[in-house]
């Protein structure tokens, strides 16, 4: 029977900069029941606070609701593991909410085959940013990535779309059914999950781009 091993806070994420959650990995339990507590203070403060919500994020997590989340202040936090034999602390972790945003996937993915008379046909893909992300404030720049593949293919073809919310793809295999998905990330945050797949049938007379 030993004191607990050192825990590690390894992940913090915010869906929209208004709330966030951090998760820790327990160290060894020393063969005894172990309690974990997360304490934090914010830059410019000395007063330590305990995690406001250990439930929402699941096991070994701390969730900071709206009233506990500030974009203006860096959070300094650590996890304490305690059993009957003693305690151990994680390293201090510094968190700036701006840099942990992982948005929801983009919405309203629409895919259409366009066959203009005077130009080569193309696949037109359009989507909307996730609802929770407020792009009007200006500090939030979302970047998008598209992936597509014929239904039975193993490999995805990836296209980086930058900040635009629509994209054209010229090179496609005629007569194939394609799956299309899109995801997004802020400049310094994390990629969202891929959006649900949209299927599109490419006509047999679709001319491949040279």
């Amino acid at each position: 029977q030993l004191p607990p091993g050192k825990p590690e806070i390894f992940k913090c994420r915010s869906p929209n900069k208004e709330t966030f959650t951090c998760w820790w990995r327990p160290g060894t339990d020393g063969g005894l029941p172990t309690n974990y507590s997360l304490t934090y203070h914010r830059e410019g403060e000395t007063l330590m606070h305990e995690c406001p919500d250990y439930i929402t994020g699941g096991p070994n997590s701390c969730h900071f609701g709206k009233q506990y989340t500030s974009m203006w202040r860096t959070y300094i936090m650590m996890v304490n593991a305690t059993n009957q034999m003693g305690s151990s602390f994680s390293d201090e972790l510094y968190v700036d909410v701006t840099y942990i945003v992982q948005p929801d996937p983009p919405l309203e993915l629409a895919v259409e085959v366009k066959q203009p008379e005077d130009r080569k046909p193309y696949l037109w893909i359009k989507w909307s940013p996730p609802t929770l992300i407020d792009l009007k404030t200006g500090w939030f720049t979302l970047l998008y990535e598209i992936r597509l593949k014929p239904e039975k293919a193993a490999e995805w073809e990836i296209h980086f779309a930058g900040q635009q919310t629509e994209f054209k793809i010229l090179s496609l295999h005629p007569g194939q059914k394609y799956l299309v998905q899109v995801r997004c990330k802020p400049d310094h945050g994390y990629w969202s999950a891929w959006s649900p797949a949209t299927f599109i049938q490419i006509p047999s007379d679709f001319t491949m781009n040279d």
Epitope: F10, M71, W72, T74, D91, Y99, T137, G138, W191
Partner: antibody, heavy 118, light 112 residues
Framework: QVQLVQSGAEVKKPGSSVKVSCKAS????????IHWVRQAPGQGLEWMGE????????NYNQKFKGRVTITADKSTSTAYMELSSLRSEDTAVYYC???????????WGQGTLVTVSS | DVVMTQTPLSLSVTPGQPASISCRSS???????????LHWYLQKPGQSPQLLIY???NRFSGVPDRFSGSGSGTDFTLKISRVEAEDVGVYFC?????????FGGGTKVEIK
């Protein structure tokens, strides 16, 4: 404890490439961005670029765009910085540095001296 | 790119005396999220840089309270209230509001 251990000094010919490694330990490698910063002899610091090891997403200083490639190998917890078309002005100490969930550098490697000379 | 200009270039200080280093940026360092990402690093002789101050005025873990940072917008200052022998080295200001991140040219602090 957190450690960033870099590969040893290199001497390279102009026009060649160099690849510097940065092995991370003491934390979950995929959690935090790794940055590369260089320092020419007797000079200031110059940020070259960064990588998110979780998905290898990179941002580069446009000054080095096309010449620098930053990669990460999750299986060995190692980040790499490759600089091509070397010239004498690339003679410098190259540092890797780690952020938290922030955009400043809390931990630094010991530095790797790259000398470009014919 | 944002140009960071440090003054003075070098500083010779008697132990126990104060020291002050100025850093000026070519454009505002206020991020669109409201934060100011101006930091100070110290590079001791033969060592890698180490973080002293983040976001203008916040001391990093383990940094003695004789170090303090202040300023806003484009003008920033690092102060050492009482210089000690272990404070010798080159001090760099750095901004991470705008990409690419940039550093000042450095201020060398020596002991008289």
């Amino acid at each position: 404890q957190v450690q960033l251990v870099q590969s040893g000094a290199e001497v390279k010919k102009p026009g060649s490439s160099v690849k510097v490694s940065c092995k991370a330990s003491g934390y979950t490698f995929t959690s935090y961005w790794i940055h590369w910063v260089r320092q020419a002899p007797g000079q200031g610091l110059e940020w070259m670029g960064e990588i998110d090891p979780s998905d290898s997403y990179t941002n580069y200083n446009q000054k080095f765009k096309g010449r620098v490639t930053i990669t990460a190998d999750k299986s060995t917890s190692t980040a790499y910085m490759e600089l091509s078309s070397l010239r004498s002005e690339d003679t410098a100490v190259y540092y890797c540095a780690r952020s938290f969930f922030t955009n400043w550098f809390a931990y630094w490697g010991q530095g790797t001296l790259v000398t470009v000379s014919s | 790119d944002v140009v960071m200009t440090q003054t003075p270039l070098s500083l010779s200080v008697t132990p126990g005396q104060p020291a002050s280093i100025s850093c000026r940026s070519s454009q505002s360092l206020v991020h669109s999220n409201g934060n100011t990402y101006l930091h100070w690093y110290l590079q001791k002789p033969g060592q890698s840089p180490q973080l002293l101050i983040y976001k203008v005025s916040n001391r990093f873990s383990g940094v003695p309270d004789r170090f303090s940072g202040s300023g806003s917008g484009t003008d920033f200052t690092l102060k050492i209230s009482r210089v000690e022998a272990e404070d010798v080295g080159v001090y760099f200001c750095s901004q991470s509001t705008h990409v690419p991140f940039t550093f000042g040219g450095g201020t060398k602090v020596e002991i008289k």
